[in-house]
Amino acid sequence: EEELQVIQPEKSVSVAAGESATLNCTATSLIPVGPIQWFRGVGPGRELIYHQKEGHFPRVTPVSDPTKRNNMDFSIRISNITPADAGTYYCVKFRKGSPDVELKSGAGTELSVRAK
């Protein structure tokens, strides 16, 4: 049995330009200790979308449901979506260290943007 699962339940989300997009992610545990970060794309050129403790992400808001008893919610909402936001978003668990070590990624959620 896996010690930690990172679950992105939606394979794809479609949002009209100007609206907000909710990207869902849950992890089965806080252990191993370390942050969850959101990225768009994969590999060395991926773009950091949200980090709880570092950086400024004015369009991104955590929208977790703290009442969920059986897992931890790390979902986010991105406001004022534009066509430039299209892409695949990944919720990634890191293990705390110096530096933090990437441990596990969700399967990704593809965001497509419809015209208004």
């Epitope: 806080l30 252990i31 008893r69 931890m72």
Partner: antibody, heavy 118, light 111 residues
Framework: EVQLVESGGGLVKPGGSLRLSCAAS????????MSWVRQTPGKGLEWVAT????????YYPDSVKGRFTLSRDNAKNSLYLQMNSLRAEDTAVYYC???????????WGQGTTVTVSS | DIVITQSPASLAVSLGERATISCRAS??????????MHWYQQKPGQPPKLLIY???NLESGVPDRFSGSGSRTDFTLTINPLQAEDVATYYC?????????FGGGTKVEIK
């Protein structure tokens, strides 16, 4: 019904060792993060050690790091705390506790008493 | 380390009245909209029992006269109305960052 039953406490001299055990039943032990928390009249509740559901990751506060070792056997639904180089300040009631998400302590055992004294 | 200051150390409240306990953390215990502060009840000779998880969520089977509130650094446990079986010591606990720490406890008695 969830049950956590601790054993292995007792009287030991400073510098000595003890191994505490916790037998779990009534839940899927292998899915839970497990911890030990101790309680003293003077210092209240103090987190002692935590282990991930599969046993790969362990965490300790500085007060016990290098002296205590936490392990688990999921096949036996058991948790173990090996305590070496015991000090008088380790005297406490030791509770085994489960954490489904590695956050709050869901269930606690009744505790086992460890006394370190010459 | 995150230090938790719990107050008051003891509290005497009349039956049917409201009991309020506070915990203040030395730094925020919030992450992704979760507040990692929890509340436990301990009666003499028994282990602690989870009452409230993540600041405001009532654990299954716990009476709804118990409630929790707060975020970031300031948290409150409220018992309303207080009943005789609520006589106990109450502890808060943060799991926002290691090492996990507890408040010093509040002993609730009947006035």
């Amino acid at each position: 019904e969830v049950q956590l039953v601790e054993s292995g406490g007792g009287l030991v001299k400073p510098g000595g060792s003890l191994r505490l055990s916790c037998a779990a039943s009534g839940f899927t032990f292998s899915s839970y993060v497990m911890s030990w928390v101790r309680q003293t009249p003077g210092k209240g509740l103090e987190w002692v050690a935590t282990i991930s559901s599969g046993g790969t990751y362990t965490y300790y506060p500085d007060s016990v790091k290098g002296r205590f070792t936490l392990s688990r056997d999921n096949a036996k639904n058991s948790l173990y705390l090996q305590m070496n180089s015991l000090r008088a300040e380790d005297t406490a009631v030791y509770y085994c506790a489960s954490q489904l998400t590695g956050s709050e302590f869901d269930y606690w055992g009744q505790g086992t008493t460890v006394t370190v004294s010459s | 380390d995150i230090v938790i200051t719990q107050s008051p150390a003891s509290l005497a409240v009349s039956l049917g009245e409201r009991a309020t306990i506070s915990c203040r953390a030395s730094e925020s215990v919030d992450s992704y909209g979760n507040s990692f502060m929890h509340w436990y009840q301990q009666k003499p000779g028994q282990p602690p029992k989870l009452l409230i998880y993540r600041a405001s969520n009532l654990e299954s089977g716990v009476p709804d006269r118990f409630s929790g509130s707060g975020s970031r650094t300031d948290f409150t446990l409220t018992i309303n109305p207080l009943q005789a079986e609520d006589v106990a010591t109450y502890y808060c606990h943060q799991s926002g960052d290691l090492p996990w720490t507890f408040g010093g406890g509040t002993k609730v008695e009947i006035k």
